[in-house]
Structure formats: C-alpha cells, structure tokens
C-alpha cells in the first residue's frame, strides 16, 4: 500500500531503536571515513524529522523518498570533497542516479585501522556509562569496514554483543568471560559479511534472476517438504529483501525481512516442521534463526526426477512454454533431493541442463540428445567431491596454520602478481574452511566447503577489481559466480611471471616480533612465505618447508635469547644466506 510519508511508515514499523540503528548503519556504509559523532548527529536529526512526520504526515518534506532525504543529509556534510574526493560529485546528480553513485563509491577495503577491542575493564566502564552510545560505536565501526553488511543481521550481532557485555561485566573475571564470547561473535559476523557480499555481487553483476536461482536452490534444500509454489514465493520475497539491503534501502530491507519472518512463522505447516523454536524468539533472533535453520526431514520416498526431465518426450515443449518455470522446477526438484550438494554445484548442474536443452531442442531428435545429460553431470559432481576430500585430508594432516600455508603457496603460485597482504588475507580465510567444515558430518562438508570458498574468492575478486594485476585472477573473476571456485582450483603456476628479485630486507626481522600476539606472528611468517614463493615460484614443497622450519627455529632461538636485538642482528643475515642457498 502507498503511504503518504515513507519515513513515518518505516519509523512506525521498525520502532525508534531499530530505526536509529539502521539509519546509522546506512550512513556509516555510505560515508566510511566520517567519525561516529558526525554520523550520530545526522541520525538524531533524521530521527527527529521522522517523529515530526509521524505526528503529521502532511508536514513539509515528509512525502519525500528516503533516498532523497538521506542523500540530502549526506550531501550537506561540510568538507565532503576534501574528505571523499569524487564521491562529492554524486551530490550534483538527481535521484535515483545519486544513490547509484553513492553505491558505486562504497569501498570494500577502506584504509581504516583494524577494529581494536578495548581492555575488558574499559569496555565495561563505557558500556555501563552509556549502553546506547557504546552499541552505536559498534554499529558504526563494523558498518564502515563492511559497507555491504546485512543491516538487520548487524542489529542482531549488536544485540548479541549487548547481551554478552551485560552478562560478563557483572562477573569478577570480566576478561575470561568476554574474550571467548566476543571472539565467537566476531568470527560469525565476519563470515556473515563475506556471505552477504557474495549475495550483493550476485545481484549487482548478474541481476535478480541469478540471486533468485540461488535462493530457490538454498530454500529447496532447507525446506524439502514445501511445494514449488511455496519455495518460489519465499525466494521472491528473499530476493526483494536482499535487493533492498544491497541497494542501501536498509529500512525497507529490515521491514520486509521482519514481514518474511512473520509469514514463515504463520505458515509453518506448508514450509517446514523445524521452524517453531525460531518462531518463539523475539524479532532479531527469530529472523537470524530462520536464516540458518536446520534442514527439514526429507520426505521418506521421493521419486527419481528422470521421468520429468530426461525421459519425457515432451521436455522441449515444456521447456519452450515457460523456460524459467521449467528450469526453476528442475532446480527445486534436484535441490530438495540433495542437501549434501553446495548451492554452487546445484546451480552449475542447472546451468548445464539449460545449455543441454538449448542445444538439443534445436536438433532433429531432441530426446536422444538430452538423454545423455546425466553422464555429463558426473564430472561436475565429482570435481567438488574430490576437492573436499583432498583438502580435508590435507587439513587433518597439517592443522589450520599448516593448511593455510599450503593454500598460500598454491595461490601465490597461481597469482604471484597479487599483493602479498591480499594473498595472506585470502589464504588465511581460505584455510579456515578446514576448521569450519572438515569436522562436520560427511553430508554437510561439501555445501560448507564450497559455498564458503566461493564467498572468500568473491572478496579476492573485489579486491583485485580495484587494481587488476593478474590475468589468471581476471579470467576467473570475469566468468559467472558459480564457476569461480572451479576456475581458481584449476589454475596452475603462472608461467608468465618473472620472479621477484631477492631482497634481504624482506626477510629481515627484529626483536619486536617476539612480543606480537600469535596471530600477528603467523601473519609475519606467512608474509615471508609468500615473498619466498614470489622469489622462487617453482620451489618444491620440501624446499619451502626447510626454509620455513629454519625460520621458525631462528625466531624461537632469538626470542628466547637474553639479548634479543643482538641475536636478530647477527643470526638474521645467516638465516637469509641459508634461505638463498636452500632455494638455489
């Protein structure tokens, strides 16, 4: 229904707290360099204005679109050009071009310092003093570093943060209560960020149809008892929600997501038997819970689908009559029978099926032609299954750190032109797949591994797009989203690469490394490993292991030495010489 005042409508639907949180996220995602105080001031102004519109929907400017209202606010910020450069040019445009322009200027890798967590005592003090401001800072800091973070989910993580602080700040040992719990939230939020960025990439690059196909596959796996009409309805609604969030329409997105959760809870009988626990929760927890609800029990007996999609003489007629509906049905029927496949694999299979029908339905004897499609699915299914087996075996043998190093070597060889920090970040993230997925039951491994890897590789592509340096990466990132992971997996050593000169300073370390937290130490060592591979791309695993073991031994010795500085300055050059010899 049309509302006289959009802003009043959203304020009423969402309530003041969520309204303010979402406006803060929106501003922080658009203008990533502004301070919290600058954004908080704008949020308060927008909220005060919304309240005037709630009181009188006919008041001045209350009929304006949210994009117009928010865009005008952003464009009124002083020193916009000095701080944001060409983003200020967006303000010369009219809506909807102005919003599109803001979206194009979102930076996936803003040059902001890492978000450091304060000491437990300091955190608890500022939380107790002003919980609202404290949580506002959290929303601001996360949103500006992750400009596509799924806004209603960020509100959920802020709520988790709030609950943890409320609980732990009342304990004697605040630190040991807070650290593991906040680490857990941080890990989940980072995964949520890359997954959502993947969805927005899908939407931006390939449009709503591509996202809806993803949603049909995912929902069919989770709700195998729901019929095709129900799955289609859910996929359509979910596509709208994600389109809004990816497009910066965060109030509409959160409101529509709440509506979708309400619909699902009111229609459990036709969707899934597993929703009740989620539906008993308050809004943010409910929507989060529904988004990761366990798969419903599959119907005891589902028939084979060959009769409808391979053996039927009328396949081409059915396909021609309504291509998207026929392919959607294929994807639905295949996905509900295969919760053990990744969404990416299911979409590749549907794509192969579509290509087969396009080819065969133009031939003299279509059934004879499309009758062979099942054999063509075999390599598509076996490739990711082998990937999972090989990589999980390697992870079990090496552990997370060793597995990350193996991936780092592999990816540095595939794309040595990529900057070392990007390679290290990618390898560390890709390596976490082992811990995240390889310990799961067999039938959950493939979807976990492949869909997680795809999301991480999407980030690699986004960073590479900014400064393209590797033809290998460009090739894999240019294709369709579902083909990326197989493309990266198939890459071999880049033969066009001219090895980097050996620079001793790259491998020179100082005693300050000894006091670094374990994670930072690992990053330093992994940076050195990537640089070694860039110097010797064809070094064997054995050679690299020798050098890295020597390096670890050197650090261990010097960090235990009474005079660390002397040890580093005398032993360091010897290490460099040994490294050069080992790789010669």
């Amino acid at each position: 229904e049309a509302h006289k005042s959009e802003i009043a409508h959203r304020y009423n639907d969402l309530g003041e707290q969520h309204f303010k949180g979402l406006v803060l996220i929106a501003f922080s995602q658009y203008l990533q360099k502004c301070s919290y105080d600058e954004h908080a001031k704008l949020v308060q102004e927008v909220t005060d204005f919304a309240k005037t519109c709630v009181a009188d929907e006919s008041a001045a400017n209350c009929d304006k679109s949210l994009h117009t209202l928010f865009g005008d606010k952003l464009c009124a910020i002083p020193n916009l050009r000095e701080n944001y450069g060409e983003l200020a040019d967006c303000c010369t445009k009219q809506e909807p071009e102005r919003n599109e322009c803001f979206l194009q200027h979102k930076d996936d890798n803003p040059s902001l310092p890492p978000f450091e967590r304060p000491e437990a005592e300091a955190m608890c003090t500022s939380f107790k003093e002003n919980p609202t401001t404290f949580m506002g800072h959290y929303l601001h800091e996360v949103a500006r570093r992750h400009p596509y973070f799924y806004a209603p989910e960020l509100l959920y993580y802020a709520e988790q943060y709030n609950e943890i602080l409320t609980q732990c700040c009342a304990e004697a040992d605040k630190e040991s209560c807070l650290t593991p719990k906040l680490d857990g939230v941080k890990e989940k939020a980072l995964v949520s960020s890359v997954r959502q960025r993947m969805k927005c990439s899908s939407m931006q690059k390939f449009g709503e149809r591509a996202f809806k196909a993803w949603a049909v596959a995912r929902l069919s796996q989770t709700f195998p008892n729901a019929d095709f009409a129900e799955i289609t309805k859910l996929a359509t609604d979910l596509t709208k929600v994600n389109k809004e969030c990816c497009h910066g329409d965060l109030l509409e997105c959160a409101d529509d997501r709440a509506e979708l959760a309400k619909y699902m809870c009111e229609n459990q009988a036709t969707i899934s038997s597993k929703l009740q626990t989620c539906c008993d929760k308050p809004l943010l927890k409910k929507a989060h819970c529904l988004s990761e609800v366990e798969h419903d029990t599959m119907p005891a007996d589902l028939p084979a689908i060959a009769a409808d999609f391979v053996e039927d003489q009328e396949v081409c007629k059915n396909y021609a009559e309504a291509k998207d509906v026929f392919l959607g049905t294929f994807l639905y029927e295949y996905s509900r029978r295969h919760p053990d496949y990744s969404v990416s694999l299911l979409l590749r299979l549907a794509k192969k099926y579509e290509a087969t029908l396009e080819k065969c339905c133009a031939e003299a004897n279509p059934p004879a032609c499309y009758g062979t499609v099942l054999a063509e699915f075999q390599p598509l299914v076996e490739e990711p299954k082998n990937l999972v087996k090989t990589n999980c075996d390697l992870y079990e043998k090496l552990g997370e750190y060793g597995f990350q190093n193996a991936i780092l070597v592999r990816y540095t060889q595939k794309a040595p032109q990529v900057s070392t920090p990007t390679l290290v970040e990618a390898a560390r993230n890709l390596g976490r797949v082992g811990t995240k997925c390889c310990t799961l039951p067999e039938d959950q491994r493939l979807p976990c591994v492949e869909d997680y890897l795809s999301a991480i590789l999407n980030r690699v592509c986004l960073l590479h797009e900014k400064t393209p340096v590797s033809e290998h990466v460009t090739k894999c990132c240019s294709g369709s989203l579902v083909e990326r992971r197989p493309c990266f997996s198939a890459l071999t050593v880049d033969e066009t690469y001219v090895p980097k000169e050996f620079k001793a300073e790259t491998f020179t370390f100082h005693s300050d490394i000894c006091t670094l937290p374990e994670k930072e130490k690992q990053i330093k060592k992994q940076t050195a490993l990537a640089e070694l591979v860039k110097h010797k791309p064809k070094a064997t695993a054995e050679q690299l292991k020798t050098v890295m073991d020597d390096f670890a031994q050197f650090l261990d010795t010097c960090c235990k030495a009474a005079d660390k500085d002397t040890c580093f300055s005398t032993e360091g050059p010897n290490l460099v010489t040994r490294c050069k010899d080992a790789l010669a």
Epitope: A300, A306, P339, Q378
Partner: nanobody, 124 residues
Framework: EVQLVESGGGVVQPGGSLRLSCAAS????????MGWFRRAPGKEREFVAA????????YYADSVKGRFTISRDNSKKTAYLQMNSLRPEDTALYYC?????????????????WGQGTLVTVSS
C-alpha cells in the same frame, strides 16, 4: 559408515534364476536409496536397479525390466535382487550400493557406499 556385503552369486544356466542379497552393517539402511550395478568383462559399470528408502519406488535398466525385481527389508538391513530368465549377457560382477541422497537413482555418482561385488555367470 555403511559396510555392504553381497551374496547369492553363482553359475546358472540361461533361463534360470538367482536371488542376490546385500547385507548392510554399521548403520540402518532405511535412510538410504539402495541400488544394484554390474560390470561385465571388458565393459563399463552399468546401472541395473534401484529402490527408494521405504520401497515405494523402484527403477530398472531397460535391459532387465520385467525379468529382475529389486526389494528391501529395512528391519533386516538387507536389499535383494531377484533375477529371473537370466541370459548370457547378464554375466557380470554385481555390486550393491547405498546412497543417502538421490535425484536420479541410476547414477553411480549419487551412491556413497559400495560392496565388493558378487559374480554371476550365465552359461550353458
């Protein structure tokens, strides 16, 4: 983990019958689609028959339709293949397979567990 052991193979004259059994251990089979495949000397492995989890659906290769019958007894954790009107071209090593999830029933890549096989020879 599911371990599958086939039995019931042997030498039989053309037109004769055999009943193959596939006994599972390590897990119940009620959550698995069960299938039979065969490999004749010098040939690729081919699909023979499959049955859905609770036995409501059965599927057969064209070459065995009307002659072979697949069945299962979940309480005994066993699947069966009754083979009648056997022909020399049915000579092969017969494998039992179990797959947790299946869209096609006839594709070997949908089966997770395999037995070692039992030899059937049809000869006069």
């Amino acid at each position: 983990e599911v371990q599958l052991v086939e039995s019931g193979g042997g030498v039989v004259q053309p037109g004769g019958s055999l009943r193959l059994s596939c006994a599972a251990s390590g897990s119940t089979i009620s959550s698995y689609v069960m299938g039979w495949f065969r490999r004749a000397p010098g040939k690729e492995r081919e699909f023979v028959a499959a049955i859905s989890r609770s036995g409501g659906y059965t599927y057969y290769a064209d070459s065995v339709k009307g002659r072979f019958t697949i069945s299962r007894d979940n309480s005994k954790k066993t699947a069966y293949l009754q083979m009648n009107s056997l022909r020399p071209e049915d000579t092969a090593l017969y494998y039992c397979a179990a797959g947790r999830y299946s869209a096609w029933y006839s594709q070997s890549y949908e089966y997770d567990y395999w037995g070692q096989g039992t030899l059937v020879t049809v000869s006069s």
